[in-house]
C-alpha cells in the first residue's frame, strides 16, 4: 500500500465508554490533526475508513458494520456503537484517503463496567462549586448528538447509590442539577442517567462527575503572610543554621496561580553567592484554600549574611504582598562571675536558653521548628 501520513496512537484521547450504552466517537483527524473538516474532505472525494486492533492483539481488522441491529455503524465522521460490548475495547483507527492522499490516526477505546452505584474505572471530570454562593448548576455532560431534539429523554440524577430526591438544597431540573446553596456535604460524585427511545429500543447514557465545593470569591482576600512577622526575631551567631519559614495563606481562586518566593537583598536566592536552600510544602483546606510554606535555610550563616535583607513575597490573582524577616547577629552574652565561687551564672543560663529567636513583647522563646507548620 502507498505511503500514508500516520499520526500514530493518540493517547491524549483516552476514550472511555460504559458497557451496554450507546457511544458516538468522532474521528480525531478532523478535531486535532487536519485543518479541514469532514464535509470539505468528503466533497473533495476523500473516503473515511475505520478499522481496529482488539485488546492484546496486533492484528488490524476491519470493523464489522453488518452486525444485527446495526450495533456498530458509521455516520459521517462518527463511529457509533448501539450499544457497546466489553470486548469492543481496543485501538481504533480512522483513515482518510483517496488515490493521491492518505492520513490516519489511531486512538484507544476502553469499554468499562460500572456497578449499581456507578463506581467504575472511568476518569471523572471535576466541577467546582463555590461554597454558600447562591444557586449554581451542573449540567449532564457529553449527551449532545445522541438523540434528536424532538426526542424528550428522561433524566434521573443520583449521588452515589441514591436517587436525588427530597434533598435539602439540591434539585434535579432535567439535564441540570441545581444547588440552591452549596455546602461541604455536597462534595461527591453525581451521576445523571439519560434514558431515550430509538427505533423501538431504550438506551441509557450514564455520566458521572465529581463536585468539589471550594472557597467563594465573595470571601477571597489577597495572600496573607503569617510568617515572617513582627513578633519573631531571627537572632543568630555566625556558624549557626539560619532557618526562616515563609508561611502564606491563599484564598481559593478559580484558575489563579499562587506564588511564593524569597528575595535576599532584593535578588532571587539563585543570584546570590551564598549556599541557600529553599524547601516548599503545600497544604489545602477542605474548600481548597492553600497554605504554602517556603523555608529558607542557610546551613552556616556568616556575619555578612546576618546583615542582609530577607523578604518573603507572595502573589495571587487577588494581589501581591511582601514581608521582611527581622534577622540580627546575636550579641555575645556578658560573662558574670560570682565572688567566692559556688554560684552559677544565672543570667548566662538565660542567654544560653535564648538560642534561636526572640518573640518581641513576650518573654517566651520558641525553637525554630515550631514555626514550620
Amino acid at each position: 500500500s502507498e505511503r500514508c501520513d500516520d499520526w500514530g496512537l493518540d493517547t491524549m484521547r483516552q476514550i472511555q465508554v460504559f458497557e451496554d450504552e450507546p457511544a458516538r466517537i468522532k474521528c480525531p483527524l478532523f478535531e486535532h490533526f487536519l485543518k479541514f473538516n469532514y464535509s470539505t474532505a468528503h466533497s473533495a472525494g476523500l473516503t473515511l475508513i475505520w478499522y481496529w486492533t482488539r485488546q492484546d492483539r496486533d492484528l488490524e481488522e476491519p470493523i464489522n458494520f453488518r452486525l444485527p441491529e446495526n450495533r456498530i455503524s458509521k455516520e459521517k465522521d462518527v463511529l457509533w456503537f448501539r450499544p457497546t460490548l466489553l470486548n469492543d475495547t481496543g485501538n481504533y483507527t480512522c483513515m482518510l484517503r483517496n488515490t493521491t492522499y492518505c492520513s490516519k490516526v489511531a486512538f484507544p477505546l476502553e469499554v468499562v463496567q460500572k456497578d449499581s452505584c456507578f463506581n467504575s474505572p472511568m476518569k471523572l471530570p471535576v466541577h467546582k462549586l463555590y461554597i454558600e454562593y447562591g444557586i449554581q448548576r451542573i449540567t449532564c455532560p457529553n449527551v449532545d448528538g445522541y438523540f434528536p431534539s424532538s426526542v424528550k429523554p428522561t433524566i434521573t440524577w443520583y449521588m452515589g447509590c441514591y436517587k436525588i430526591q427530597n434533598f435539602n438544597n439540591v434539585i434535579p431540573e432535567g439535564m441540570n442539577l441545581s444547588f440552591l446553596i452549596a455546602f461541604i456535604s455536597n462534595n461527591g460524585n453525581y451521576t445523571c442517567v439519560v434514558t431515550y427511545p430509538e427505533n423501538g429500543r431504550t438506551f441509557h447514557l450514564t455520566r458521572t462527575l465529581t463536585v468539589k465545593v471550594v472557597g467563594s470569591p465573595k470571601n477571597a482576600v489577597p495572600p496573607v503572610i503569617h510568617s515572617p512577622n513582627d513578633h519573631v526575631v531571627y537572632e543568630k551567631e555566625p556558624g549557626e543554621e539560619l532557618l526562616i519559614p515563609c508561611t502564606v495563606y491563599f484564598s481559593f481562586l478559580m484558575d489563579s496561580r499562587n506564588e511564593v518566593w524569597w528575595t535576599i537583598d532584593g535578588k532571587k536566592p539563585d543570584d546570590i553567592p551564598i549556599d541557600v536552600t529553599i524547601n516548599e510544602s503545600i497544604s489545602h483546606s477542605r474548600t481548597e484554600d492553600e497554605t504554602r510554606t517556603q523555608i529558607l535555610s542557610i546551613k552556616k550563616v556568616t556575619s555578612e549574611d546576618l546583615k542582609r535583607s530577607y523578604v518573603c513575597h507572595a502573589r495571587s490573582a487577588k494581589g501581591e504582598v511582601a514581608k521582611a524577616a527581622t534577622v540580627k547577629q546575636k550579641v555575645p552574652a556578658p560573662r558574670y562571675t560570682v565572688e567566692g565561687g559556688g554560684g552559677t551564672g544565672g543570667l548566662n543560663d538565660i542567654f544560653e536558653a535564648q538560642k534561636i529567636e526572640w518573640h518581641e513583647g513576650g518573654g517566651h522563646h520558641h525553637h525554630h521548628h515550631h514555626h514550620h507548620h
Epitope: D115, S116, C117, N119, M159, G160, C161, Y162, K163, I164, Q165, N166, F167, N168, N169, V170, S185, N186, N187, G188, N189
Partner: antibody, heavy 122, light 107 residues
Framework: QVQLVQSGAEVKKPGSSVKVSCKAS????????IQWVRQAPGQGLEWMGY????????DYAQKFQGRVTITADESTSTAYMELSSLRSEDTAVYYC???????????????WGQGTLVTVSS | EIVMTQSPATLSVSPGERATLSCRAS??????LAWYQQKPGQAPRLLIY???TRATGIPARFSGSGSGTEFTLTISSLQSEDFAVYYC?????????FGQGTKVEIK
Amino acid sequence: QVQLVQSGAEVKKPGSSVKVSCKASGSPAEPYAIQWVRQAPGQGLEWMGYIIPSLGGYDYAQKFQGRVTITADESTSTAYMELSSLRSEDTAVYYCARGQTLYAAGRQFDIWGQGTLVTVSS
Amino acid sequence: EIVMTQSPATLSVSPGERATLSCRASQSVSSNLAWYQQKPGQAPRLLIYGASTRATGIPARFSGSGSGTEFTLTISSLQSEDFAVYYCQQYNNWPWTFGQGTKVEIK
C-alpha cells in the same frame, strides 16, 4: 468504631403511631445513609426506606408510603422512623443499618442497630 | 420490584460438611447481590457483597458465586457458629429486596 444504638421495645395500640430512634456514634466525615428494615416474628427482612441525614434525601418502599416518616437530627446523629396507623401485622423487630459512604455498592447495610421490638396489640 | 427466591427453605447439614445455598432473582441483577447471616435474637451481619466479595472479618470458608439471576453461597466446612438463617439481597434496582431466607440447621 461506628455503632448504632436503638431505642427500647414498645407496646402500641392498633391505630396509634410509634417512633423508633437510632443513634450513631463515630460518624464518618462524609455523607451516609441510614436504612430501616423490619422483621416480623419468624419472617424475613423487609426494607422500609432510608434517609441521608446530612443532605435530607429520603425514600420509602411503596408498601409503606403514606404511613412511614423517616427523619434525622444531625446535631445528635440520630435518625427516627415513625410508623402510623399501626395494625397487628406491624408487630416486628425494626432495625436501622448504615454504610460508611453513599458510594459503596452492596455495603449500605454494613453496620446494624440491635433492633427494637414493636408489639401492636389491643 | 425484583423478587428474590431462596432455596431450600431449610438445610440440614452436619458440622464439618459443605453447605450450598441458592438464591434466584426474578430478573438480572448483574453481580449486585449481597448475603447476610442472622442468628437468633441478633441483627443480620453482612457476609458477601458484589456476589463474591467477602466483607471485612468474614472467614474464608464463606464464598459466593453467580451473576445475572442465579447465585450461590457456599460454606465449605460448617462450624457450630455457622448454624443460622441466611438472606440474599439484590441492590441492582430500587427497591432493594431480600430473599425469604434459608435456615441452616444441625443434622
